[in-house]
């Protein structure tokens, strides 16, 4: 069955199967280079 790949936090659709968080947090460190 189809799963919704990404919906933001103000949406009711599921993101569980998408592999992406519904509203990803900003990373707190920078990669070198």
């Amino acid at each position: 069955s189809e799963t919704t790949t990404g919906t933001s936090s103000n949406s009711s659709q599921s993101t569980s199967n998408s592999g992406l968080a519904p509203n990803p947090t900003n990373a707190t460190t920078k990669a070198a280079g």
Epitope: E2, T3, T4, T5, G6, T7, S8, N10, S11, Q13, S16, N17, S18, G19, L20, A21, P22, P24, T25, N26, A27, T28, T29, A31
Partner: antibody, heavy 115, light 112 residues
């Protein structure tokens, strides 16, 4: 069957522009965030851009390396997503994949930026 | 950015033998909803990436149960209980918890 098909790649000179397209079938396109990911021997797999849903006012996000140069858009009526790339650099060379996130991927289209 | 470090770089395995790949993140991938957005992809030669596992341990449809994902926080593992010829290719981890999304450098699985 879910299918994502990219087009629009090719050879372009540094400083030039190119527009990539991706047509999606087999899923409810308007319910899915869409992303572009690129792959190069130098940098491996690198997430490039994302566009969210109409309910999110089509919010967009970009990798720092392409901010101000690339724009992403979508046409829900056609199940299409686009990546407009301006002021291209040699380091933008790679295979560009259209993906719903991590689950569905297109076959990729190759962009070569070279003089 | 969250750095995803995969080891080993290359894995040479005899068919029927087990294999294990490690992926470590520079920050915890636990999201505020209690879920951990760590995925595993396989890119077979000449093909685009295909997802095998999402949310650390959930197998995608059609993925054989010889694949197992485990881990938490910053430390994750993909295990293949018995390697088959179709398993060759490059395995990548990708995190979807923090923006920007980042990939591991890949682990090439070769068949001995």
């Amino acid at each position: 069957e879910v299918k994502l098909e990219e087009s629009g790649g090719g050879l372009v000179q540094p400083g030039g522009s190119m527009k990539l397209s991706c047509v999606v079938s087999g899923l409810t396109f308007s319910n899915h965030w869409m992303n572009w990911v690129r792959q190069s021997p130098e940098k491996g797999l690198e997430w490039v851009a994302q566009i969210q849903l109409k309910s999110d006012n089509y919010a967009t996000r970009f990798a720092e390396s392409v901010k101000g140069r690339f724009t992403i858009s979508r046409d829900d009526s056609k199940s299409d997503v686009y990546l407009q790339m301006n002021n291209l650099r040699t380091e933008d060379t790679g295979i560009y994949y259209c993906t719903t996130g991590t689950d569905y991927w297109g076959q990729g289209t190759t962009l070569t930026v070279s003089s | 950015d969250v750095v995803m470090t995969q080891t080993p770089l290359t894995l040479s395995v005899t068919i029927g033998q087990p294999a294990s790949i490690s992926c470590k993140s520079s920050q915890s991938l636990l999201y505020s909803n209690g879920k951990t957005y760590l995925n595993w992809l396989l890119q077979r030669p000449g093909q685009s990436p295909k997802r095998l596992i999402y949310l650390v341990s959930n197998l995608d449809s059609g993925v054989p149960d010889r694949f197992t994902g485990s881990g938490s926080g910053t430390d994750f593992t993909l295990k293949i209980s018995r390697v088959e010829a179709e398993d060759l290719g490059v395995y990548y981890c990708i995190q979807g918890t923090h923006f920007p999304y980042t990939f591991g450098g890949g682990t090439k699985l070769e068949i001995k």
